[in-house]
């Protein structure tokens, strides 16, 4: 690891469209990239009436939005397609949804965020 950060060398691979794309459905994907670039894992999923449907998992390009994230967490509020990325081998095995709450005014009542979904 460089400067203590976890280098991503492989990620959990999944492709829901594996038949159409003629790929494996699941497996482990080695992550390649230029020496000066960081590599990440990602997961993409949908929430269909409360049921989690994974779209893709695998390696992701050098992306500042993924830096130093050991957990794969989607923070956008209710996206149509959920996405998270992280650093560290196989860090995309588990993923969660934990939207950041927009605080407009301080309140004495604590706000409970929506529960996360896990693979």
């Amino acid at each position: 690891a460089i400067l203590g950060r976890s280098e991503t060398q492989e990620c959990l691979f999944f492709n829901a469209n594996w038949e159409k794309d003629r790929t494996n459905q699941t497996g482990v994907e080695p992550c390649y990239g230029d020496k000066d670039k960081r590599r990440h894992c990602f997961a993409t999923w949908k929430n269909i009436s409360g049921s989690i449907e994974i779209v893709k998992q695998g390696c992701w390009l050098d992306d500042i939005n993924c830096y130093d994230r050991t957990d794969c967490v989607e923070k956008k509020d209710s996206p149509e397609v959920y996405f998270c990325c992280c650093e560290g081998n196989m860090c995309n095995e588990k993923f969660s949804y934990f939207p950041e709450m927009e605080v407009t005014q301080p309140t004495s009542n604590p706000v409970t965020p929506k529960p996360p979904y896990y693979n």
């Epitope: 003629r22 390649y32 990239g33 695998g58 390696c59 992701w60 390009l61 939005n65 397609v81």
Partner: antibody, heavy 120, light 107 residues
Framework: EVQLLESGGGLVQPGGSLRLSCAAS????????MNWVRQAPGKGLEWVAG????????GYADSVKGRFTISRDNSKNTLYLQMNSLRAEDTAVYYC?????????????WGQGTLVTVSS | DIQMTQSPSSLSASVGDRVTITCRAS??????LNWYQQKPGKAPKLLIY???SRASGVPSRFSGSGSGTDFTLTISSLQPEDFATYYC?????????FGGGTKVEIK
């Protein structure tokens, strides 16, 4: 320095065949996905085909499926596009382009292109 | 296939102007969105990938934003070398598809 050099373009009659090559240098070719993208004269970009780092996964645009075949020879650092049953609408500049993974295909390096003209 | 629609198809601007190009996907593509710049007679060049990440060597005046179906490429202060055609591209699903392009011309 990453370099991609296409060759094999030229004039061919409708129904004919051509094989394009893309010679890669300056990076570990066997670690990257590769793609062919074309651009008809005065038009936009159209993805033609893609292949992952070891040739295990291949994908094609519907417009070329069954006629074009993408392949690679990692020992020669070369990408190929075999084009059969060529049509006038296949006339374009063909670019090879590198991508990191099959599913996050930002095409980060491109060759200079080779012109394919299909005409009688 | 996912359709990518760019607007405007062309625009005229002056050096120093702020320029915004939009790209709309026919379905949600999360952040699988890239932008390219192409100059006449040259190959396209990757500018922005994964919506917001600048490719190596791309000046900070280029920025990307958006998510889901609506995306924007912004050039904060147009420079002479920025006059070119810009394309968006989705990599959420195969086949990869590009927008029709936006030609940025000198006013």
């Amino acid at each position: 320095e990453v370099q991609l050099l296409e060759s094999g373009g030229g004039l061919v009659q409708p129904g004919g065949s051509l094989r394009l090559s893309c010679a890669a240098s300056g990076f570990t070719f066997s670690s990257y996905g590769m793609n062919w993208v074309r651009q008809a004269p005065g038009k936009g970009l159209e993805w033609v085909a893609g292949i992952n780092y070891n040739g295990g996964y291949k994908g094609y645009a519907d417009s070329v499926k069954g006629r074009f075949t993408i392949s690679r020879d990692n020992s020669k650092n070369t990408l190929y596009l075999q084009m059969n049953s060529l049509r006038a609408e296949d006339t374009a500049v063909y670019y090879c382009a590198r991508s990191a993974n099959w599913h996050d295909t930002a095409l980060d390096y491109w060759g200079q292109g080779t012109l394919v003209t299909v005409s009688s | 296939d996912i359709q990518m629609t760019q607007s405007p198809s062309s625009l005229s601007a002056s050096v120093g102007d702020r320029v915004t190009i939009t790209c709309r996907a026919s379905q949600s593509i999360s952040n699988y969105l890239n932008w390219y710049q192409q100059k006449p007679g040259k190959a396209p060049k990757l500018l922005i990938y994964a919506v917001t990440s600048r490719a190596s060597g791309v000046p900070s005046r280029f920025s990307g934003s958006g998510s889901g179906t609506d995306f924007t490429l912004t050039i904060s202060s147009l420079q002479p070398e920025d006059f070119a055609t810009y394309y968006c591209q989705q990599s959420y699903d195969s086949p990869l598809t590009f927008g029709g392009g936006t030609k940025v011309e000198i006013k």
